[in-house]
C-alpha cells in the first residue's frame, strides 16, 4: 500500500481541519487507514481520524481540534495497520480555508435595488470575523454566460446592486464565498445558492 499524493490540509481556524490525499490504488479508506495527529508540545494526547473515501483512490479526513490557536502545530502520521505510510506536520494558522458564509438571502422589496445579505461564518470572538472579504457570484439561470462576480471588500456582509443591471423577467441565482486577507487564505467553498426572479421594469419614460 502506497501514498500517491501526500496529504494536504486546511483549517477553518476554529475547530476543524481537513486533510486530503490519494493512494496508489483503490482503497477502502475507513477500513484500511488511520490518520493520527498530535499537538507538538510536551506529551500531548494523540488523536485518531478515520478517513472517508473521496473518489476511487482519494481519502479525506476531518480532524477535530480543540480551539485552534496561532501557536498550534500538529504532527500527522498516516497508518495502514502497523505500517507507517507517511509522516508530516501541519500548522493550522498557516493553511486557513475559511468556513463558507451562510443564510444568503435576496431582498427585492425595494423596487430598483436587489439587496443580498448573508451571515459571517465566524463568531465575533474569532479574529477572522473582522478579516473576511467576500465574492458574490450572480448568474442568469437560463444563460450561464450571463454571470458576474462582485467583490465585497468592506466588512458588512451585504451587497446592493441596481435591479436595472439585471435582465427583466429572468430568474437569477447567487452564491457567496469568503477569504481572509491578513492570513492570505484560500477561498472558502461557495455558500448554497439562492434564487430570485427579477421583476424590475424600467420606468416608462426610459423605454
Amino acid at each position: 500500500m502506497k501514498v500517491l499524493q501526500e496529504p494536504t490540509c486546511v483549517s477553518d481556524y476554529m475547530s476543524i481541519s481537513t486533510c486530503e490525499w490519494k493512494m496508489g490504488g483503490p482503497t477502502n479508506c475507513s477500513a484500511e487507514l488511520r490518520l493520527l495527529y498530535q499537538l507538538v508540545f510536551q506529551s500531548s494526547e494523540t488523536h485518531t481520524c478515520v478517513p472517508e473515501n473521496n473518489g476511487g483512490v482519494g481519502c479525506v479526513c476531518h480532524l477535530l481540534m480543540d480551539d485552534v490557536v496561532s501557536m498550534d502545530n500538529y504532527t500527522l502520521d498516516l497508518w495502514a495497520g502497523q505500517q507507517l505510510l507517511w509522516k508530516g506536520s501541519f500548522k493550522p494558522s498557516e493553511h486557513v480555508k475559511p468556513r463558507a458564509p451562510g443564510n444568503l438571502t435576496v431582498h427585492t422589496n425595494v423596487s430598483d435595488t436587489v439587496l443580498l445579505t448573508w451571515s459571517n461564518p465566524y463568531p465575533p470572538d474569532n479574529y477572522l470575523y473582522n478579516d473576511l472579504t467576500y465574492a458574490v457570484n450572480i448568474w442568469n439561470e437560463n444563460d450561464l454566460a450571463d454571470s458576474r462576480i462582485h467583490n465585497v471588500t468592506y466588512l458588512k456582509p451585504t451587497l446592493r446592486i441596481p435591479a436595472s443591471t439585471l435582465k427583466s423577467g429572468i430568474s437569477y441565482r447567487a452564491r457567496v464565498r469568503a477569504w481572509a486577507q491578513h492570513y492570505n487564505t484560500t477561498w472558502s467553498e461557495w455558500s448554497p445558492s439562492t434564487k430570485w426572479y427579477n421583476s424590475y421594469r424600467e420606468p416608462f419614460e426610459q423605454r
Epitope: V40, D67, V69, S70, M71, D125, N126, Y127
Partner: antibody
Amino acid sequence: QVQLQESGGGLVQPGGSLRLSCAASGFTFSSYSLTWVRQAPGKGLEWVSTIKARGGTTLYADSVKDRFTISRDNAKNTLYLLMNSLKPEDTAVYYCAKPLYSNLAGDLGSWGQGTTVTVSS
Amino acid sequence: DIQMTQSPSSLSASLGDRVTITCQASQSISSYLAWYQQKPGQAPKLLIYGGSRLQTGVPSRFSGSGSGTSFTLTISGLETEDLATYYCLQDYSWPLTFGQGTKLEIK
C-alpha cells in the same frame, strides 16, 4: 467591560500547595483560552500555563509541568491554578490573562491586577 | 523553544524623542509578535499584536514593524506617561516566550 480578578495568593512553605483563582466577567468566558503569566520580583514576564476553551487542552511551561494544574469552571466563569510542590523560585506575582480573540491566544488584551505568591520557610 | 532577545535592556531618552526597541527571534515567527507595556506596580498592557496592529485605545505614536525574525517597536514622540518596561512576546509556537524586557527611562 472585561474584568479579571485573581485571588488565593499568600505565603507558603517550600513543598506546600496553593490554589489561585481568577474570577472573570464581561465576556463569554467559555469561548476563550485563558493564560497564567508570572513575574518574579524585579524580573521579566514568564508564561506559566494556558487552558483552551472547549476541549480543555492544557499546556504548561517546563518549569511548572507536573507540579501545577490549570483548570476552569465555565459555569462559574472562573480560572484556577493549583500549585503543588512549591519552590522558592515560584515566588512571583501571578496574573491571569485573556486574549483579544479566541484564536490568537498569545495576544493578551486583558489582564488581572495579579496575586502575590511567596514561597519561603 | 523560540528565544526572544530584546535590545537594549534599558534606555534613557528625552521627551519628544523617537525611541526604537528591537526584538530578535531565534527562528522565523512570521508576524506572530506582540508588544506589551508595563508600568511600575501595574499589570502589563497590550500595545501591538500581529507585529504591527495597534490595539484599540493605544496612542498612534506607538507602532510596530517587522516579520520573520526581526521586529521593532517605535515610539514616535516620547511622552512622560511612556515611562515603563516594554516586552515582546512570540505567539507563533508553544511555549509562549517573552523577551527579557526593555526599561525606558526619561532623561
